[in-house]
Amino acid sequence: GRLVHMTVVSGSNVTLNISESLPENYKQLTWFYTFDQKIVEWDSGKSKYFESKFKGRVRLDPQSGALYISKVQKEDNSTYVMRVLKKDGYEQEWKIKLQVLDPVPKPVIKIEKREDVDDNCYLKLSCVIPGESVNYTWYGELPKEIQNSVLETTLKPHKHSRCYTCQVSNSVSSKNGTFCFSPPCTAARS
Protein backbone atom coordinates (compact mmCIF):
# COMPACT_ATOMS: atom_id res chain seq x y z
CA GLY A 1 0.00 0.00 0.00
CA ARG A 2 1.13 3.51 -0.79
CA LEU A 3 1.47 5.81 2.21
CA VAL A 4 0.84 9.55 2.05
CA HIS A 5 1.46 11.94 4.96
CA MET A 6 -0.91 14.82 5.65
CA THR A 7 -0.67 17.47 8.35
CA VAL A 8 -3.65 19.70 9.08
CA VAL A 9 -4.79 22.18 11.70
CA SER A 10 -7.35 21.08 14.30
CA GLY A 11 -10.87 22.31 13.68
CA SER A 12 -10.42 22.31 9.92
CA ASN A 13 -12.26 20.25 7.31
CA VAL A 14 -10.10 17.64 5.60
CA THR A 15 -10.30 15.72 2.35
CA LEU A 16 -8.55 12.36 2.32
CA ASN A 17 -8.01 11.37 -1.26
CA ILE A 18 -5.62 9.48 -3.47
CA SER A 19 -3.59 11.03 -6.23
CA GLU A 20 -4.55 8.44 -8.83
CA SER A 21 -7.89 7.43 -10.27
CA LEU A 22 -9.82 4.55 -8.75
CA PRO A 23 -9.88 1.16 -10.50
CA GLU A 24 -12.65 1.14 -13.09
CA ASN A 25 -15.97 -0.40 -12.04
CA TYR A 26 -14.67 -1.46 -8.67
CA LYS A 27 -16.91 -3.75 -6.65
CA GLN A 28 -16.57 -2.39 -3.13
CA LEU A 29 -14.73 0.44 -1.42
CA THR A 30 -14.13 0.80 2.32
CA TRP A 31 -12.41 3.48 4.39
CA PHE A 32 -10.88 2.26 7.63
CA TYR A 33 -9.61 4.13 10.66
CA THR A 34 -6.43 2.30 11.65
CA PHE A 35 -6.14 -1.26 10.41
CA ASP A 36 -9.68 -2.54 10.71
CA GLN A 37 -12.18 0.00 12.08
CA LYS A 38 -14.68 0.71 9.30
CA ILE A 39 -15.77 4.30 8.76
CA VAL A 40 -17.76 4.02 5.54
CA GLU A 41 -18.28 1.47 2.81
CA TRP A 42 -19.58 1.74 -0.72
CA ASP A 43 -21.25 -1.40 -2.04
CA SER A 44 -23.99 -2.10 -4.58
CA GLY A 45 -24.43 1.57 -5.39
CA LYS A 46 -24.88 2.87 -1.86
CA SER A 47 -22.76 4.16 1.00
CA LYS A 48 -23.05 2.71 4.48
CA TYR A 49 -21.70 4.72 7.41
CA PHE A 50 -20.63 2.76 10.47
CA GLU A 51 -21.06 3.55 14.15
CA SER A 52 -17.79 5.27 14.91
CA LYS A 53 -16.50 8.53 16.26
CA PHE A 54 -16.74 9.86 12.70
CA LYS A 55 -20.45 9.27 12.25
CA GLY A 56 -22.15 12.50 11.23
CA ARG A 57 -18.95 14.26 10.20
CA VAL A 58 -17.76 12.18 7.25
CA ARG A 59 -18.90 11.93 3.66
CA LEU A 60 -17.69 9.63 0.90
CA ASP A 61 -17.45 10.58 -2.75
CA PRO A 62 -17.74 7.18 -4.50
CA GLN A 63 -16.53 8.67 -7.80
CA SER A 64 -13.11 9.67 -6.56
CA GLY A 65 -13.01 7.66 -3.33
CA ALA A 66 -12.40 10.89 -1.39
CA LEU A 67 -13.38 10.96 2.26
CA TYR A 68 -14.39 14.32 3.68
CA ILE A 69 -14.01 14.74 7.44
CA SER A 70 -15.28 17.88 9.12
CA LYS A 71 -13.83 19.52 12.22
CA VAL A 72 -10.85 17.23 12.74
CA GLN A 73 -9.37 16.99 16.23
CA LYS A 74 -6.04 15.73 17.56
CA GLU A 75 -7.77 12.47 18.51
CA ASP A 76 -8.28 11.87 14.78
CA ASN A 77 -4.52 11.36 14.35
CA SER A 78 -4.22 7.96 12.70
CA THR A 79 -3.45 6.03 9.56
CA TYR A 80 -6.53 5.90 7.35
CA VAL A 81 -6.80 3.02 4.88
CA MET A 82 -8.89 2.97 1.75
CA ARG A 83 -9.34 -0.57 0.44
CA VAL A 84 -10.92 -1.22 -2.91
CA LEU A 85 -12.11 -4.63 -4.04
CA LYS A 86 -11.90 -4.86 -7.81
CA LYS A 87 -14.20 -6.86 -10.06
CA ASP A 88 -11.51 -9.54 -10.51
CA GLY A 89 -11.22 -10.02 -6.75
CA TYR A 90 -7.91 -8.25 -6.42
CA GLU A 91 -7.56 -5.61 -3.76
CA GLN A 92 -5.85 -2.28 -3.83
CA GLU A 93 -5.19 -0.16 -0.80
CA TRP A 94 -4.00 3.33 -0.07
CA LYS A 95 -2.93 4.70 3.30
CA ILE A 96 -2.98 8.27 4.54
CA LYS A 97 -1.22 9.10 7.78
CA LEU A 98 -3.08 12.08 9.17
CA GLN A 99 -1.46 14.33 11.74
CA VAL A 100 -3.74 16.90 13.33
CA LEU A 101 -1.97 19.76 15.10
CA ASP A 102 -3.41 22.54 17.23
CA PRO A 103 -2.47 26.06 16.13
CA VAL A 104 0.45 27.26 18.25
CA PRO A 105 -0.43 29.71 21.04
CA LYS A 106 1.22 33.14 21.30
CA PRO A 107 4.55 32.68 23.07
CA VAL A 108 5.47 34.36 26.34
CA ILE A 109 8.98 35.80 26.54
CA LYS A 110 10.60 35.55 29.95
CA ILE A 111 13.76 37.32 31.14
CA GLU A 112 15.89 34.56 32.57
CA LYS A 113 18.88 36.82 33.24
CA ARG A 114 19.71 40.49 32.73
CA GLU A 115 22.89 42.12 33.97
CA ASP A 116 25.28 44.95 33.22
CA VAL A 117 28.72 43.70 32.37
CA ASP A 118 31.37 46.36 31.59
CA ASP A 119 28.80 48.80 30.16
CA ASN A 120 27.33 46.02 28.09
CA CYS A 121 23.96 44.45 28.73
CA TYR A 122 23.95 40.67 28.95
CA LEU A 123 20.51 39.16 28.24
CA LYS A 124 19.14 35.67 28.48
CA LEU A 125 15.55 35.38 27.22
CA SER A 126 13.39 32.31 26.96
CA CYS A 127 10.43 31.82 24.69
CA VAL A 128 7.79 29.70 26.39
CA ILE A 129 4.71 27.96 25.10
CA PRO A 130 2.90 25.17 26.95
CA GLY A 131 3.93 21.60 26.10
CA GLU A 132 4.13 21.82 22.34
CA SER A 133 6.60 20.36 19.92
CA VAL A 134 7.44 23.44 17.84
CA ASN A 135 10.24 25.24 16.04
CA TYR A 136 11.68 28.44 17.47
CA THR A 137 13.32 31.30 15.59
CA TRP A 138 14.59 34.55 17.09
CA TYR A 139 14.72 37.73 15.03
CA GLY A 140 16.28 41.08 15.87
CA GLU A 141 19.71 42.65 15.68
CA LEU A 142 21.51 39.39 16.13
CA PRO A 143 24.78 38.12 14.64
CA LYS A 144 22.89 35.10 13.28
CA GLU A 145 19.41 33.59 13.29
CA ILE A 146 18.91 31.57 16.46
CA GLN A 147 16.70 28.48 16.30
CA ASN A 148 16.35 27.69 19.93
CA SER A 149 13.87 28.48 22.70
CA VAL A 150 16.57 30.43 24.55
CA LEU A 151 18.30 33.57 23.30
CA GLU A 152 21.56 34.73 24.84
CA THR A 153 23.04 37.99 23.59
CA THR A 154 25.11 40.95 24.73
CA LEU A 155 23.98 44.46 23.87
CA LYS A 156 26.65 47.05 23.27
CA PRO A 157 25.83 50.55 24.53
CA HIS A 158 23.05 51.88 22.30
CA LYS A 159 20.79 54.89 21.96
CA HIS A 160 17.60 53.28 20.78
CA SER A 161 15.53 50.46 22.16
CA ARG A 162 16.27 47.00 20.82
CA CYS A 163 13.52 44.50 20.14
CA TYR A 164 13.72 40.73 19.90
CA THR A 165 11.00 38.64 18.33
CA CYS A 166 10.49 34.96 19.02
CA GLN A 167 8.54 33.09 16.36
CA VAL A 168 7.10 29.71 17.30
CA SER A 169 5.78 27.54 14.51
CA ASN A 170 4.60 24.07 13.68
CA SER A 171 3.72 22.88 10.22
CA VAL A 172 0.24 24.42 10.33
CA SER A 173 0.66 27.78 12.10
CA SER A 174 3.03 30.32 13.60
CA LYS A 175 2.83 33.08 16.23
CA ASN A 176 5.22 35.82 17.34
CA GLY A 177 6.12 37.37 20.66
CA THR A 178 8.32 40.49 20.98
CA PHE A 179 10.33 41.95 23.85
CA CYS A 180 12.08 45.35 23.73
CA PHE A 181 14.88 46.84 25.81
CA SER A 182 15.74 50.50 26.16
CA PRO A 183 19.26 51.58 26.98
CA PRO A 184 21.21 50.66 28.91
CA CYS A 185 19.49 47.44 30.02
CA THR A 186 15.88 48.16 30.86
CA ALA A 187 12.97 45.97 29.88
CA ALA A 188 10.71 48.32 27.97
CA ARG A 189 7.69 46.40 26.68
CA SER A 190 6.47 43.16 25.24
Epitope: Q28, S44, K48, R83, L85, Y90, E91, E93, K95
Partner: antibody, heavy 117, light 107 residues
Framework: QVQLVQSGAEVKKPGASVKVSCKAS????????IHWVRQAPGQGLEWMGI????????RYAQKFQGRISMTWDTSTSTVFMELSSLKSEDTAVYYC??????????WGRGTPVTVSS | DIQMTQSPSSVSASVGDRVTITCRAS??????LAWYQQKPGKAPNLLIF???SLQSGVPSRFSGSGSGTDFTLTISSLQPEDFGTYYC?????????FGQGTKVEIN
Protein backbone atom coordinates in the same frame (compact mmCIF):
# COMPACT_ATOMS: atom_id res chain seq x y z
CA GLN B 1 3.43 -19.03 -9.72
CA VAL B 2 2.80 -17.67 -6.22
CA GLN B 3 2.88 -20.25 -3.44
CA LEU B 4 2.68 -20.33 0.32
CA VAL B 5 5.16 -22.92 1.55
CA GLN B 6 4.78 -24.11 5.15
CA SER B 7 7.15 -25.84 7.54
CA GLY B 8 6.79 -29.54 8.39
CA ALA B 9 4.79 -31.48 10.98
CA GLU B 10 5.43 -30.91 14.69
CA VAL B 11 4.87 -33.02 17.81
CA LYS B 12 4.81 -31.10 21.09
CA LYS B 13 4.19 -31.75 24.76
CA PRO B 14 1.45 -29.90 26.66
CA GLY B 15 2.68 -26.52 27.92
CA ALA B 16 5.28 -26.21 25.14
CA SER B 17 5.26 -23.75 22.23
CA VAL B 18 5.22 -24.34 18.50
CA LYS B 19 6.46 -22.03 15.76
CA VAL B 20 5.15 -22.61 12.23
CA SER B 21 6.60 -20.79 9.23
CA CYS B 22 4.99 -19.76 5.96
CA LYS B 23 7.06 -18.52 3.04
CA ALA B 24 5.47 -16.58 0.19
CA SER B 25 7.47 -17.69 -2.83
CA UNK B 26 7.21 -16.24 -6.30
CA UNK B 27 5.24 -13.22 -5.16
CA UNK B 28 6.07 -9.69 -6.24
CA UNK B 29 3.54 -7.85 -4.08
CA UNK B 30 4.64 -4.90 -2.00
CA UNK B 31 1.57 -5.33 0.15
CA UNK B 32 -0.01 -8.59 1.16
CA UNK B 33 -1.72 -10.20 4.12
CA ILE B 34 -1.20 -13.54 5.79
CA HIS B 35 -3.98 -15.14 7.83
CA TRP B 36 -3.64 -18.24 10.00
CA VAL B 37 -6.48 -20.75 10.10
CA ARG B 38 -6.53 -24.05 11.93
CA GLN B 39 -8.55 -27.22 11.61
CA ALA B 40 -8.79 -29.79 14.38
CA PRO B 41 -9.24 -33.45 13.29
CA GLY B 42 -12.70 -33.94 11.78
CA GLN B 43 -13.66 -30.33 12.60
CA GLY B 44 -14.29 -27.10 10.70
CA LEU B 45 -12.07 -24.11 10.00
CA GLU B 46 -11.11 -21.62 12.71
CA TRP B 47 -9.55 -18.22 11.97
CA MET B 48 -6.67 -17.33 14.31
CA GLY B 49 -5.33 -13.99 13.11
CA ILE B 50 -3.96 -11.77 10.36
CA UNK B 51 -0.71 -9.96 9.80
CA UNK B 52 0.57 -7.53 7.20
CA UNK B 53 4.36 -7.99 7.00
CA UNK B 54 4.60 -4.74 5.06
CA UNK B 55 3.43 -2.44 7.86
CA UNK B 56 3.48 -4.69 10.90
CA UNK B 57 -0.24 -4.57 11.56
CA UNK B 58 -1.50 -7.69 13.31
CA ARG B 59 -4.87 -8.74 14.68
CA TYR B 60 -5.59 -11.91 16.66
CA ALA B 61 -8.81 -13.73 17.46
CA GLN B 62 -9.77 -13.10 21.09
CA LYS B 63 -9.60 -16.83 21.81
CA PHE B 64 -5.85 -16.90 21.17
CA GLN B 65 -4.95 -13.49 22.58
CA GLY B 66 -2.01 -13.74 24.96
CA ARG B 67 -0.59 -16.97 23.58
CA ILE B 68 -0.29 -16.29 19.87
CA SER B 69 2.34 -14.23 18.13
CA MET B 70 2.81 -13.53 14.44
CA THR B 71 6.19 -12.27 13.29
CA TRP B 72 7.89 -12.01 9.94
CA ASP B 73 11.19 -11.80 8.15
CA THR B 74 10.61 -9.48 5.21
CA SER B 75 14.00 -10.29 3.68
CA THR B 76 12.87 -13.88 3.07
CA SER B 77 9.11 -13.18 2.75
CA THR B 78 8.50 -15.57 5.63
CA VAL B 79 5.79 -15.19 8.27
CA PHE B 80 5.89 -17.11 11.56
CA MET B 81 3.04 -18.05 13.85
CA GLU B 82 3.95 -19.08 17.38
CA LEU B 83 1.41 -20.59 19.74
CA SER B 84 2.41 -21.10 23.37
CA SER B 85 1.03 -23.00 26.40
CA LEU B 86 -0.12 -25.80 24.11
CA LYS B 87 -2.97 -28.07 25.16
CA SER B 88 -4.24 -31.28 23.59
CA GLU B 89 -7.12 -29.25 22.06
CA ASP B 90 -4.51 -27.39 19.97
CA THR B 91 -3.87 -30.57 17.97
CA ALA B 92 -4.79 -29.46 14.46
CA VAL B 93 -3.57 -28.69 10.98
CA TYR B 94 -2.41 -25.07 10.87
CA TYR B 95 -2.81 -23.28 7.56
CA CYS B 96 -1.42 -19.97 6.44
CA UNK B 97 -3.61 -18.28 3.85
CA UNK B 98 -3.58 -15.03 1.93
CA UNK B 99 -2.84 -12.87 0.19
CA UNK B 100 -5.82 -10.59 0.51
CA UNK B 101 -7.22 -8.66 3.44
CA UNK B 102 -10.78 -9.87 2.99
CA UNK B 103 -10.60 -13.47 1.84
CA UNK B 104 -8.10 -16.21 1.10
CA UNK B 105 -7.30 -16.87 -2.52
CA UNK B 106 -4.16 -18.81 -1.69
CA TRP B 107 -3.48 -21.43 0.99
CA GLY B 108 -0.41 -23.24 2.25
CA ARG B 109 -0.59 -27.05 2.39
CA GLY B 110 -0.96 -27.01 6.16
CA THR B 111 1.31 -27.94 9.06
CA PRO B 112 0.05 -30.75 11.31
CA VAL B 113 0.72 -30.06 14.99
CA THR B 114 0.16 -32.84 17.52
CA VAL B 115 0.09 -32.02 21.22
CA SER B 116 0.51 -35.14 23.31
CA SER B 117 2.20 -36.12 26.54
CA ASP C 1 -18.40 -12.27 16.91
CA ILE C 2 -20.52 -12.92 13.83
CA GLN C 3 -21.97 -16.43 13.83
CA MET C 4 -22.27 -18.25 10.50
CA THR C 5 -24.81 -21.07 10.23
CA GLN C 6 -24.75 -23.42 7.26
CA SER C 7 -27.40 -25.86 6.13
CA PRO C 8 -27.71 -28.67 5.45
CA SER C 9 -24.76 -30.21 7.31
CA SER C 10 -24.53 -32.88 4.60
CA VAL C 11 -26.09 -33.60 1.25
CA SER C 12 -25.97 -36.65 -0.98
CA ALA C 13 -26.78 -36.10 -4.64
CA SER C 14 -26.30 -37.63 -8.07
CA VAL C 15 -24.16 -36.41 -10.94
CA GLY C 16 -26.09 -33.73 -12.86
CA ASP C 17 -28.20 -32.72 -9.85
CA ARG C 18 -28.58 -29.12 -8.74
CA VAL C 19 -27.23 -28.66 -5.23
CA THR C 20 -27.98 -25.67 -3.01
CA ILE C 21 -26.21 -24.81 0.26
CA THR C 22 -27.34 -21.92 2.41
CA CYS C 23 -25.46 -19.80 4.88
CA ARG C 24 -26.95 -17.38 7.40
CA ALA C 25 -25.03 -14.64 9.22
CA SER C 26 -26.04 -13.53 12.73
CA UNK C 27 -25.88 -9.90 11.55
CA UNK C 28 -25.84 -7.92 8.31
CA UNK C 29 -22.56 -8.53 6.47
CA UNK C 30 -23.58 -6.79 3.24
CA UNK C 31 -21.98 -8.93 0.50
CA UNK C 32 -18.82 -9.76 2.44
CA LEU C 33 -19.06 -13.52 2.06
CA ALA C 34 -16.73 -16.13 0.57
CA TRP C 35 -17.29 -19.81 -0.23
CA TYR C 36 -14.55 -22.46 -0.09
CA GLN C 37 -14.38 -26.09 -1.13
CA GLN C 38 -12.19 -28.51 0.83
CA LYS C 39 -11.30 -32.05 -0.17
CA PRO C 40 -10.09 -34.57 2.43
CA GLY C 41 -6.46 -34.00 3.43
CA LYS C 42 -6.18 -30.83 1.35
CA ALA C 43 -6.29 -27.11 2.01
CA PRO C 44 -9.52 -25.25 1.18
CA ASN C 45 -9.94 -23.64 -2.21
CA LEU C 46 -11.69 -20.30 -2.84
CA LEU C 47 -14.76 -20.59 -5.09
CA ILE C 48 -16.74 -17.37 -4.60
CA PHE C 49 -15.83 -13.99 -3.11
CA UNK C 50 -17.99 -10.96 -2.36
CA UNK C 51 -21.07 -13.23 -2.23
CA UNK C 52 -21.44 -13.69 -5.99
CA SER C 53 -18.11 -13.22 -7.79
CA LEU C 54 -16.56 -16.34 -9.23
CA GLN C 55 -12.88 -16.79 -8.46
CA SER C 56 -10.69 -17.11 -11.54
CA GLY C 57 -10.36 -20.74 -12.71
CA VAL C 58 -13.48 -21.97 -10.90
CA PRO C 59 -16.05 -23.71 -13.18
CA SER C 60 -19.15 -21.65 -14.01
CA ARG C 61 -21.47 -24.32 -12.59
CA PHE C 62 -20.68 -22.76 -9.21
CA SER C 63 -22.57 -19.58 -8.38
CA GLY C 64 -23.24 -17.52 -5.28
CA SER C 65 -26.03 -15.16 -4.36
CA GLY C 66 -27.44 -13.20 -1.46
CA SER C 67 -26.62 -10.19 0.65
CA GLY C 68 -27.25 -8.98 4.18
CA THR C 69 -27.70 -12.13 6.24
CA ASP C 70 -28.83 -14.86 3.80
CA PHE C 71 -26.55 -16.41 1.19
CA THR C 72 -26.65 -19.36 -1.18
CA LEU C 73 -24.06 -21.44 -3.00
CA THR C 74 -25.46 -23.33 -5.99
CA ILE C 75 -23.84 -26.09 -8.03
CA SER C 76 -26.01 -26.15 -11.14
CA SER C 77 -24.97 -29.60 -12.34
CA LEU C 78 -23.05 -31.71 -9.85
CA GLN C 79 -19.89 -33.36 -11.17
CA PRO C 80 -17.97 -36.28 -9.63
CA GLU C 81 -15.08 -33.98 -8.68
CA ASP C 82 -17.39 -31.72 -6.66
CA PHE C 83 -17.44 -33.98 -3.60
CA GLY C 84 -15.95 -32.47 -0.46
CA THR C 85 -16.89 -30.06 2.30
CA TYR C 86 -18.06 -26.53 1.52
CA TYR C 87 -17.56 -23.65 3.95
CA CYS C 88 -18.94 -20.13 3.94
CA UNK C 89 -16.91 -17.38 5.61
CA UNK C 90 -17.83 -13.82 6.52
CA UNK C 91 -15.14 -11.33 5.54
CA UNK C 92 -16.95 -8.28 6.90
CA UNK C 93 -15.34 -8.18 10.31
CA UNK C 94 -12.73 -9.59 12.63
CA UNK C 95 -12.58 -12.28 13.73
CA UNK C 96 -13.24 -13.83 10.34
CA UNK C 97 -15.68 -16.66 11.04
CA PHE C 98 -16.66 -19.77 9.08
CA GLY C 99 -19.80 -21.79 8.84
CA GLN C 100 -19.55 -25.32 10.25
CA GLY C 101 -19.37 -26.86 6.78
CA THR C 102 -21.61 -28.83 4.43
CA LYS C 103 -20.40 -32.24 3.28
CA VAL C 104 -21.37 -33.03 -0.32
CA GLU C 105 -21.33 -36.71 -1.29
CA ILE C 106 -21.96 -38.18 -4.70
CA ASN C 107 -24.56 -40.97 -4.84
Amino acid sequence: QVQLVQSGAEVKKPGASVKVSCKASGHTFTNYYIHWVRQAPGQGLEWMGITNPNDGNTRYAQKFQGRISMTWDTSTSTVFMELSSLKSEDTAVYYCAGLRYWFFDLWGRGTPVTVSS
Amino acid sequence: DIQMTQSPSSVSASVGDRVTITCRASQDISSWLAWYQQKPGKAPNLLIFAASSLQSGVPSRFSGSGSGTDFTLTISSLQPEDFGTYYCQQTDNFPRTFGQGTKVEIN
